[in-house]
């Protein structure tokens, strides 16, 4: 499973769960819940530490009769870090044992680096839109945890579905768009 | 099929205000996004503003202070308002459609204002 | 602050295949979308890819769009070019969900 492996294709559907409007003026982030994924691919590129994967994704967001005409582009981080302090370690047979002894107690994971706000705009079958705020990623990195660190890296499958957010000023034009946020 | 007409003053004096109007015809401003874009004589594009498709505008941060746009539906048109002309506000402006984000791209293009800032 | 870099201008010979580049200064570009636009002296601008790589109705396949991770930037391929596609080209994206624009590349057929 190289970093240099051939593309392939990924995308998957988010269902964004509505919640209690508000008068913000701007799109808020969302806090917690879950979303729903189909059709995955996925493509490679090589620019973090050594098993630690940036693969590319896209997702349609769908919410109920709205949803986006293109999809959303952001990264996943997978794979298993092997930083290259510890590749010789690895590597070399007779260190084997060294390398697992240490992994023992410690372990380097592919997680989040580097996080962007982003806008996307579903069109509903009436002819409405609707408006969400949504955190993509866009790099990973590799991060060391202690072996009771419990901590589990952010990725598109804990990521958290819309919050809607009316804006006040829609409501007084009585417009049928809305807006949303989601992380 | 899709259009996108700018109209307005071709000449505008120093310190006055620019008002412009954007006629779109074959499609919904409730389903696209309508920027306004400009373009100094030999130079690149500048995006000045959006009126999205909900109604929500946003401005380019270094235009934000002298310029508001808004929009009719019931007539099908966009109008752009600019305060305090100075003669770099000498500019061809163009009203374009935007697709819905992301993506996004800027599908339609009208022909473009030419507007001159002098006395 | 997200910036698109366009090299000023480029030469090219007549059926010849040239690949003008638009860089981004930050992230990861195969998360964002690149569009690209030609235009004519005094006329309006027209698009001739968008989403990264794809072609709007009319426009030549000769003309293809492309994505580098490697160096972070789009690329504009015209295969066989001809003397109309003498013009400037611009790229385009949005950080967040405000456009940005590269600085143009004015294409010289020779």
């Known amino acids: 499973f190289k970093n240099d492996a051939t593309e392939i294709l990924y995308s998957h559907v988010v269902k964004p769960v509505p919640a209690h409007p508000s008068s913000n003026s701007t799109l808020n982030q969302a806090r917690n819940g879950g979303r729903h994924f189909s059709n995955t691919g996925l493509d490679r590129n090589t620019r973090v530490q050594v098993g630690c994967r940036e693969l590319r994704s896209t997702k349609y967001i769908s919410d109920g009769q709205c949803t986006s005409i293109s999809p959303l582009k952001e990264l996943v981080c997978a794979g298993e870090c092997l930083p290259l302090p510890v590749l010789p370690n690895w590597i070399g047979g007779g260190y084997g044992t060294k390398y697992w002894s240490r992994r023992s107690s410690q372990e380097w994971r592919c997680v989040n680096d580097k996080t962007r706000t982003q806008r996307i705009q579903l069109q509903c079958q009436d002819g409405s839109t609707r408006t969400y705020k949504i955190t993509v990623v866009t790099a990973c990195k590799c991060k060391r945890y202690t072996r009771q660190h419990n901590e589990s890296s952010h990725n598109f499958e804990s990521m958290s579905p819309a919050k809607p957010v009316q804006h006040h000023r829609e409501r007084k034009r009585a417009s049928k768009s809305s807006k949303h946020s989601m992380s | 099929q899709v259009q996108l007409m700018e109209s307005g003053p071709g000449l505008v004096q120093p310190s006055e205000t620019l008002s412009l109007t954007c006629t779109v015809s074959?499609?919904?401003?409730?389903?696209?996004?309508v920027h306004w874009v400009r373009q100094p004589p030999g130079k690149g594009l500048e995006w000045m503003g959006v009126?999205?498709?909900?109604?929500?505008?946003d401005y380019n941060s270094a235009l934000k202070s002298r310029l508001s746009i808004r929009r009719d539906t019931s007539k099908n048109q966009v109008f752009l308002k600019m305060n305090s002309l100075q003669s770099e506000d000498t500019n061809t402006y163009y009203c374009?459609?935007?697709?819905?984000?992301?993506?996004?791209?800027?599908?339609?293009w009208g022909q473009g204002v030419m507007v001159t800032v002098s006395s | 602050q997200v910036m698109l870099t366009q090299p000023k201008s480029v030469s090219t010979s007549l059926e010849s295949t040239v690949k003008l580049s638009c860089k981004l200064n930050?992230?990861?570009?195969?998360?964002?979308?690149i569009h690209w636009y030609q235009q004519h002296e005094g006329r309006s601008p027209t698009t001739m890819i968008y989403?990264?790589?794809?072609?709007p109705d009319g426009v030549p396949d000769r003309f293809s769009g492309s994505i580098d991770s490697s160096s972070n930037s789009a690329f504009l391929t015209i295969n066989n070019v001809q003397t109309e596609d003498e013009a400037i080209y611009f790229c385009?994206?949005?950080?967040?969900?405000?456009?940005?624009f590269g600085g143009g590349t004015k294409l010289t057929v020779l």
């Open positions: 009126l999205w498709s909900d109604g929500d505008t």
């Open positions: 385009h994206s949005y950080d967040d969900h405000i456009p940005i």
């Open positions: 930050s992230d990861n570009i195969g998360t964002y979308y």
């Open positions: 074959g499609f919904s401003l409730t389903s696209y996004n």
């Open positions: 374009v459609r935007g697709g819905l984000l992301p993506g996004g791209y800027f599908d339609y």
């Open positions: 989403g990264d790589d794809k072609r």
